[in-house]
């Protein structure tokens, strides 16, 4: 019989990563922290009135490679950055909105600024 507090070696499992969350927190989140097996992210995008909105939080491992790849979406100004190097690493991410292209004014709805 093994002594209490003594067991066989653990099989490697993903270690949970804690991220800061803002506008993207789980229900009952304490101190605006979420937990993930994937990535922390910070994202900036334009809302319907053209104002920049910053969102941050957790991305699950499945599908996060695609989500963290900042592929341009037509008529949508958005930028996302992801990290895993340490807990709350997304506090230090500061994505910026991509510059407006002339095309955006032609193809998209007309915004009076």
């Amino acid at each position: 019989k093994k002594e209490d507090g003594e067991s066989t070696a653990p099989t490697p499992r993903p270690k949970v990563l804690r991220c800061k969350c803002h506008h993207h927190c789980p229900e009952d989140s304490v101190n605006n922290i979420c937990s993930t097996d994937g990535y922390c992210f910070t994202m900036i995008e334009e809302d319907d009135s053209g104002l920049p909105v910053v969102t941050s939080g957790c991305l699950g491992l499945e599908g996060s490679d695609f989500q963290c790849r900042d592929t341009p979406i037509p008529h949508q100004r958005r930028s996302i950055e992801c990290c895993t190097e340490r807990n709350e690493c997304n506090k230090d991410l500061h994505p910026t909105l991509p510059p407006l292209k002339n095309r955006d004014f032609v193809d998209g709805p007309i915004h009076h600024r």
């Epitope: 507090g5 653990p10 993903p14 949970v16 804690r18």
Partner: antibody
């Protein structure tokens, strides 16, 4: 094999502080979170908080903020929990436990803390 | 904080009987990103440390006898012991590992008739 070694008992006077230890072996210390859990006699389990030894990042249960301070010494693979301003309410068994995904894979044998004058 | 409620608080069973205990959470423990339920079960024998039985609601920890079966999803979970043995006399706790602060149920004490 994984071992989390804790002293069996500590006797401390009210108002004092105590630093409980948990010496880890049998695994890579920085690869798992270290948690501390309180259990009063005949009662349930309360999560105090956790620390990631790889970056010393800590989280605390709001109830234990200001009461508990978690630290690690990675050179000796030892985790510590300091409890301050002790009262009889702090008399309990304190367990250290490790996790990858916030469930507790392995537990220490527990330290029985008695606060008494 | 997520509140975990266990029932019954105690039950007395005979060797060979089937045992069922319940654990309910105040919010869903199902993560949409990976469709996993973040609930664990522990067994604590008198004078010993708790021991992990089940995690992600239904994944049995290696070395745990297959008579221990975890089930459920969302907010309602069950631990079943298909044929109780004398060595199963213990307290059983559920715990959510969905987000911090991590929280436990008050426990179910299994006694033998």
């Amino acid at each position: 094999q994984v071992q989390l070694q804790q002293p069996g008992a500590e006797l401390v006077k009210p108002g004092a502080s105590v630093k409980l230890s948990c010496k880890a072996s049998g695994y890579t210390f920085t690869s798992y979170w270290m948690h501390w859990v309180k259990q009063r006699p005949g009662q349930g389990l309360e999560w105090i908080g956790d620390i990631d030894p790889s970056d010393r990042y800590t989280n605390y249960n709001q109830k234990f903020k200001g009461k508990a301070t978690l630290t690690v010494d990675t050179t000796s693979s030892t985790a510590y929990m300091q409890l301050s301003s002790l009262t009889s309410e702090d008399s309990a068994v304190y367990y250290c436990a490790i996790s990858g995904w916030d469930y507790f894979d392995y537990w220490g044998q527990g330290t029985t803390l008695t606060v008494s004058s | 904080d997520i509140v975990m409620t266990q029932s019954p608080s105690s039950l007395a069973m005979s060797v060979g009987q089937k045992v069922t205990m319940s654990c309910k959470s105040s919010q869903s423990l199902l993560k949409s990103s990976n469709q996993k339920n973040y609930l664990a079960w522990y067994q604590q024998k008198p004078g010993q440390s708790p021991k992990l039985l089940v995690y992600f609601a239904s994944t049995r920890e290696s070395g745990v006898p297959d008579r221990f079966i975890g089930s459920g999803s969302g907010t309602d979970f069950t631990l079943t012991i298909s044929s109780v043995q004398a060595e199963d006399l213990a307290d059983y706790f559920c715990q959510q590992h969905y987000n911090i602060p991590l929280t436990f149920g008050a426990g179910t004490k299994l006694e033998l008739k």
